[in-house]
């Protein structure tokens, strides 16, 4: 025959524990009922009744399968740097994270202590890693050939356009400016003639730019077949 | 490049006070300007910063007492309602946005500092 | 908030000694750290940025090291120069912070 199943409250055996989701009551020297996620122990167990449980108030939460007398206080609301992630229930705790733009600058077991905003690169500096949920933006001088012309928490530095005559040199803060040349030269075979060199730009996404009024003459190397830009001239 | 404050003046307590802090060879639309305090003999008592978009940001015993706003060639720290605890000479500093960091957190240039003398 | 803490409030030393300034600050700032030098009369001059890069026109006798929650500036050779009290100042976070600056240490140079 099976062993009889006991029923909550019962004497464990001498030198076992009880069961999954039971506790060991010292007063009433019983295994008895943990309550559930969102209750806790209204009334603790004696020999001859198990614990009974009850809801936790409203801003008050139990997680685990607990026998607290009083549910745990949820965390105050977010501050206006912070948004909720997860809200406040019988089950569950409030977590606050940083909003866009914001990192958490000193944490807590769970959620934020104290959001900050992310630092950004100054023009002739790029990101060097970008800012997470937990730490800073850190900026790096644009390496020569490249450039950052943006104060930016995400812009990289980037390539300077590739001129066939070049007007004005690119510095770190500066695209290269390239010379305007005769509407009749042809372009040379398999290159790409764009406005603005769009695939050597920053990976971040970003407003398209407007094009220049004057005619572009810029030209990048040859990239493989490639339709013409929008607005393009085929000089 | 520089910076210099003025405005500081004896007050009694109550009249609200606006210090003013001019920039020269540097746009203000491209740095942090700070707000620092210093008591006769006492240390230094950061007030606020704002930021190159025009956000202020407070010491937490400075927040409803002081107001820091700009133009685009001055910044001005606005006392509303002095004390004579508010004594002090105030600087006004620009962060140095070394490292590359539109917020390097260090300061330099300072201006020399304006008085404030708040008694009955 | 973060709160940093200077010691000693004051230190004398003879001409050509060395005198060592410790800052700390109650919470991980990383290397976000300055140093200040100020003489009477005068505002603050930056000496040391990111907790130990020299600032410009600053004698190599001054340095800054550290990280995360403890600094230290030491100045060797001291001059009479250099009498002036010293400010350790964390450039980490601005958001929810009573003071940035340290205390302040006065140094004395006999």
């Known amino acids: 025959l099976p062993a009889q199943v006991a029923f909550t409250p019962y004497a464990p055996e001498p030198g076992s524990t009880c069961r999954l989701r039971e506790y060991y009551d010292q007063t009433a020297q019983m295994c008895c009922s943990k309550c559930s996620p969102g209750q806790h122990a209204k009334v603790f167990c004696t020999k001859t009744s198990d614990t009974v449980c009850d809801s936790c108030e409203d801003s008050t939460y139990t997680q685990l399968w607990n026998w607290v007398p009083e549910c745990l206080s949820c965390g105050s609301r977010c501050s206006s740097d912070q948004v909720e992630t997860q809200a406040c229930t019988r089950e569950q705790n409030r977590i606050c994270t940083c909003r866009p733009g914001w990192y958490c600058a000193l944490s807590k077991q769970e959620g934020c202590r104290l959001c900050a905003p992310l630092r950004k690169c100054r023009p002739g500096f790029g990101v060097a890693r970008p800012g997470t949920e937990t730490s800073d933006v850190v900026c790096k001088p644009c390496a020569p050939g490249t450039f950052s012309n943006t104060t930016s928490s995400t812009d990289i530095c980037r390539p300077h356009q590739i001129c066939n005559v070049v007007a004005i040199p690119g510095n770190a803060s500066m695209d290269a400016v390239c010379t305007s040349t005769s509407p009749t030269r042809s372009m040379a075979p398999g290159a790409v003639h764009l406005p603005q060199p769009v695939s050597t730009r920053s990976q971040h996404t970003q407003p398209t730019p407007e094009p220049s009024t004057a005619p572009s003459t810029s030209f990048l190397l040859p990239m493989g077949p490639s339709p013409p830009a929008e607005g393009s001239t085929g000089d | 490049q520089s910076v210099e404050e003025s405005g500081g003046r004896l007050v009694t307590p109550g009249t609200p006070l606006t210090l003013t802090c001019k920039a020269s060879?540097?746009?203000?639309?491209?740095?942090?300007m700070t707000w620092v305090r210093q008591a006769p003999g006492k240390g230094l008592e950061w007030i606020g910063i704002?930021?190159?978009?025009?956000d202020s940001y407070y010491a937490t015993w400075a927040k409803g007492r002081f107001t820091i706003s700009k133009t685009s060639t001055t910044v001005d720290l606005k006392i509303s309602s002095p004390t004579t605890e508010d004594t002090a000479t105030y600087f006004c500093?620009?962060?140095?946005?070394?490292?590359?960091?539109?917020?390097?957190?260090?300061?330099?240039?300072w201006g020399p500092g304006t008085l404030v003398t708040v008694s009955s | 908030a973060i709160k940093m803490t200077q010691t000693p409030a004051s230190v004398s030393e003879p001409v050509g000694g060395t005198v060592t300034i410790k800052c700390q600050a109650s919470?991980?700032?990383?290397?976000?750290l300055a140093w200040y030098q100020q003489k009477p009369g005068q505002p603050p001059k930056l000496l040391i940025y990111?907790?130990?890069k020299l600032a410009s026109g600053v004698p190599s006798r001054f340095k800054g090291s550290g990280s995360g929650t403890q600094f230290t500036l030491t100045i060797s050779d001291l001059e009479c120069a250099d009498a002036a009290t010293y400010y350790c100042?964390?450039?980490?976070?601005?958001?929810?912070?009573?003071?940035?600056f340290g205390g302040g240490t006065e140094v004395v140079v006999k």
């Open positions: 500093a620009r962060d140095t946005g070394y490292g590359g960091y539109d917020y390097a957190g260090s300061f330099d240039p």
């Open positions: 060879g540097f746009s203000l639309s491209d740095y942090f």
């Open positions: 704002i930021n190159t978009g025009g």
């Open positions: 919470e991980n700032i990383n290397s976000w």
């Open positions: 990111e907790a130990s």
């Open positions: 100042q964390q450039g980490y976070i601005y958001i929810d912070v009573g003071n940035i």
